[in-house]
């Protein structure tokens, strides 16, 4: 019975470690991108409270990832003329 309990605890512990590892991996990937160099605008203030008060690591990572994606779309549109990737493409031009 003790072995079973240990097995359950070990499994739960491993899952927690996996989640933390995944979070750190996401954070490292995002940190290589925008990494806070670019400031967010109105979009940051508009985030729901639940998101704003959730786990700091993941909120920060998500915010950075969002900025990274926004900048990528901007660069594609203004320097690459990739209109498909525009924020709102209404088919003009």
């Amino acid at each position: 019975r003790r072995d079973v309990a240990h097995g359950i605890l070990n499994e739960a512990y491993r899952k927690v470690l996996d989640q933390l590892s995944a979070g750190k991996h996401l954070q490292s990937l995002v940190a290589r991108g925008v990494g806070g160099s670019l400031g967010g605008g109105a979009g940051d203030d508009a985030e729901p409270l639940s998101k704003r008060h959730s786990d700091g690591i993941f909120t920060d990572s998500y915010s950075r990832y969002r900025k990274q994606m926004a900048v990528k779309k901007y660069l594609a549109a203004v320097l690459g003329k990739r209109y498909k990737q525009r924020v709102k493409n209404k088919g003009r031009r």
């Epitope: 605008g41 660069l75 203004v78």
Partner: antibody, heavy 107, light 109 residues
């Protein structure tokens, strides 16, 4: 695309520049601010996207605020220093530029 | 921060000749999203090239952009008097947005 609001200001006095567009749907385009100090090169300040979110160059964050309405895009220089003396350009997608507006910061 | 280094100014070119302007980036340009601009005194910049090598609408075919990664070049063939201007490259970076090169003045003789 036309910029306005440039003038002589003393250091620390907030200044708002306005970019007025006609025939352009701001909900479909990125609007960018670029500046150029007298006799110097171009310097990217930041942009505002279709949804109204603004993004800034690392050096510009906290020093500038970009916002927009239906036919205007504003650039606020929160606390100008002499280093902010420049011609400020507003551009749609970097392919349609205004003539620029000159800001002089001096005591 | 990303730095774009251009051919030092000024660059001289004879009418009908060819001139090449180099633009070297301190780090890889995202998606090769690099543009070239022409600016004349008292005027705003005019986009000549986007996506490193695509000619912007209405720009004469004597302008040609090439390169990828960290090294890009603007070549003007059959130079005309009207080409006298300062040329800027502008590269895209996910970590820094847009960075402009320092500019290269082309003098036509």
């Amino acid at each position: 695309v036309e910029e306005s609001g440039g003038r002589l200001v003393t250091p620390g006095t907030p200044l708002t520049l306005t970019c007025t567009v006609s025939g352009i749907d701001l909900s479909s385009y990125y609007m960018t601010w670029v500046r150029q100090a007298p006799g110097k090169g171009l310097e990217w300040v930041g942009f505002i996207d279709a949804g109204g979110s603004a993004y800034y160059a690392t050096w510009a964050k906290g020093r500038f605020t970009i916002s927009k309405a239906s036919t205007t895009v504003d650039l606020k220089i929160t606390s100008p220093t002499t280093e902010d003396t420049a011609t400020y350009f507003c551009a749609r997608d970097l392919d349609l530029w205004g003539p620029g507006t000159l800001v002089t910061v001096s005591s | 921060a990303a730095v774009l280094t251009q051919t030092p100014s000024p660059v001289s070119a004879a009418v009908g000749g060819t001139v090449s302007i180099s633009c070297k980036s301190s780090e890889s340009v995202y998606g090769d999203y690099l543009a070239w601009f022409q600016q004349k005194p008292g005027q705003p910049p005019k986009q000549l090239i986007y996506d490193a090598s695509t000619l912007a609408s209405g720009v004469p075919s004597r302008f040609k952009g090439s390169g990828s990664g960290t090294q890009f070049t603007l070549t003007i063939s059959g130079v005309q008097c009207d080409d006298a201007a300062t040329y800027y490259c502008a590269g895209g970076y996910v970590s820094a947005g847009v960075a402009f090169g320092g500019g290269t003045e082309v003098v036509v003789k």
